[in-house]
Interface confidence: low
């Protein structure tokens, strides 16, 4: 028992005065705590705790589940403990089968013994399978068996605690190790489209894909320079054990001009963070802007060729394009094509090819274009010398 200087509060005294006690199943456990300021006994095993306000703890018929640490505490908060093993040949292990290990950390297989005098307390693979060669463990009869530095490869490993009793190997119930992967890289994030152009009242919907080793990756859509919480919906999949994918879809059902801005999909884990942005532009109505690629006043010599070229921006997409001269529409000699094959493209090119012009073919050539919201036109004045 501990000794202290006179005048200082001392820890309680426990009888029997030993750190460990072994009793047989069915026998009596009788523990006496002596202290003028006795407060309580506490019993702990695995995640269970039990309290007793009597200074004598009596269990008339001990069972294997009475194995554990009995602690007496006094009013000064000082305590003393005794560990009791209840030897039961039919129940050598107490078991908490939940077994989770964080990658690169140690984890405890919780199978404390009821008899500390059995031998060869260790781990064994299920169905006689060997354990991974690099798996290291440290047995502790009072706590269980500590697996050192859990590897990702141990995920779903089936194992038993094992002891030798009278020359025979006895196995506990089986444990399945679930490994929580450590984050060793930032999440991978991507967005369905880098920019969106919409008219007022149209729906804005954008999807961010987040990939990581586990579902505990955090992700959110944020509006740049705004704290407003955005409404998002999630879909997620586990493609195998350490390949997790989440799709976070942000929707604004009826976009307004002031919804325009940059939206960021942000994801982070314990390793770091990553983000990707998309730009939304909302216009009150559609538009067409025409840019001549040559001067709108053109001088050519008789018999020469000239190409009249315009670029134009149209949103929504152009529906009707035509070149007109003297109230007549050209059916050929011109072509119209998108400037890029990108699905976000709003820029187009139109070219009218005039060949071997005669003096009588001078005048005003007009390009007309329309979409569902607006019409636009540009005129070229051609002089043939």
């Amino acid at each position: 028992q501990p000794s202290v200087s006179p005048g200082e509060p001392s820890p309680p005294s426990i009888h029997p005065g030993k750190s460990d006690l072994i009793v047989r199943v069915g026998d009596e456990i009788r523990l006496l705590c002596t202290d003028p300021g006795f407060v309580k006994w506490t019993f702990e095993i695995l995640d269970e705790t039990n309290e007793n306000k009597q200074n004598e703890w009596i269990t008339e018929k001990a069972e294997a589940t009475n194995t554990g640490k009995y602690t007496c505490t006094n009013k000064h908060g000082l305590s003393n403990s005794i560990y009791v093993f209840v030897r039961d040949p039919a129940k050598l292990f107490l078991v908490d089968r939940s077994l989770y290990g964080k990658e690169d950390n140690d984890t405890l297989v919780r199978c404390p013994l009821t008899d500390p005098e059995v031998t060869n307390y260790s781990l064994k693979g299920c169905q006689g399978k060997p354990l991974p060669k690099d798996l290291r463990f440290i047995p502790d009869p009072k706590a269980g068996i500590m697996i050192k530095s859990v590897k990702r490869a141990y995920h779903r490993l089936c194992l038993h605690c094992s002891v030798d009793q009278e020359g025979k190997s006895v196995l506990s119930e089986k444990f399945i190790l679930k490994v929580r992967p450590a984050f060793k890289a930032v999440p991978v994030v991507s967005v369905s489209k880098a920019s969106y152009l919409l008219r007022e009242g149209e729906e804005f919907t954008v999807t961010c894909t987040i990939k990581d080793v586990s579902s505990s990756v955090y992700s959110t859509w944020k509006r740049e320079n705004s704290q407003t919480k955005l409404q998002e919906k999630y879909n997620s999949w586990h493609h195998g054990d350490f390949n997790y994918e989440r799709q976070a879809t942000l929707t604004i059902s009826s976009a307004r001009v002031n919804d325009s801005g940059v939206f960021m999909c942000y994801a982070n884990n314990t390793f770091g963070s990553a983000n990707v942005t998309t730009t939304l532009e909302v216009v009150d109505k559609g538009f067409i802007n025409i840019f001549p690629m040559i001067n709108t006043t053109v001088f050519v010599n008789d018999g020469e060729n000239v190409d009249l070229i315009v670029e134009y921006e149209a949103f929504p997409k152009p529906e009707h394009q035509q070149w007109i001269y003297m109230n007549r529409t050209f059916t050929d000699k011109w072509e119209d094509y998108p400037k890029s094959e990108n699905e976000s493209n709003i820029r187009y090119v139109s070219e009218l090819h005039l060949t071997r012009l005669k003096g009588t073919e001078g005048g005003t050539y007009t390009f007309l274009v329309s979409n569902s919201d607006v019409n636009a036109a540009i005129a070229f004045n051609v002089y043939v010398n």
């Epitope: 995640d47 989770y100 929580r180 505990s216 999630y234």
Partner: nanobody, 129 residues
Framework: QVHLVESGGGLVQAGGSLGLSCAAS????????MGWFRQAPGKEREFVAA????????LYADSVKGRFTISRDNGENTVYLQMNSLKPEDTAVYYC??????????????????????WGQGTLVTVSS
């Protein structure tokens, strides 16, 4: 995906009270036990209190028993920690945590840190003497 956000921390005089809240999103909150832990500077993170999925079972660290009360509102996806008779030694960052390893619908609560898979970022409680 689980996201836990604590709030309610701050500076309080010894003997005063403070209420912490933890809002959970992204999980069927009502299926799981929840816990509060705390970490004082330079010390290990320690268990404070836990509550079962239904609120029927609670567990407290000896150091807070009788002073702190844990409760939950499954409709609001929120767990609370009411702290009364605060002492300077209660100064710490308080974390809320979700135990997704427990069996759905059991009254199980645990003080063991390793059982809790999801953690909030923490809220600082300072008790001045």
């Amino acid at each position: 995906q689980v996201h836990l956000v604590e709030s309610g921390g701050g500076l309080v005089q010894a003997g005063g009270s403070l209420g912490l809240s933890c809002a959970a999103s992204g999980h069927t909150f009502s299926n799981y036990a929840m816990g509060w832990f705390r970490q004082a500077p330079g010390k290990e993170r320690e268990f404070v209190a836990a509550i079962s999925w239904s609120g029927g079972s609670t567990l407290y660290a000896d150091s807070v028993k009788g002073r702190f009360t844990i409760s939950r509102d499954n409709g609001e996806n929120t767990v609370y920690l009411q702290m009364n008779s605060l002492k300077p030694e209660d100064t710490a960052v308080y974390y809320c945590a979700l135990d997704s390893t427990g069996v759905y619908g059991t009254g199980y609560v645990s003080s063991r840190k390793g059982r809790y898979e999801y953690w909030g970022q923490g809220t600082l409680v300072t008790v001045s003497s």
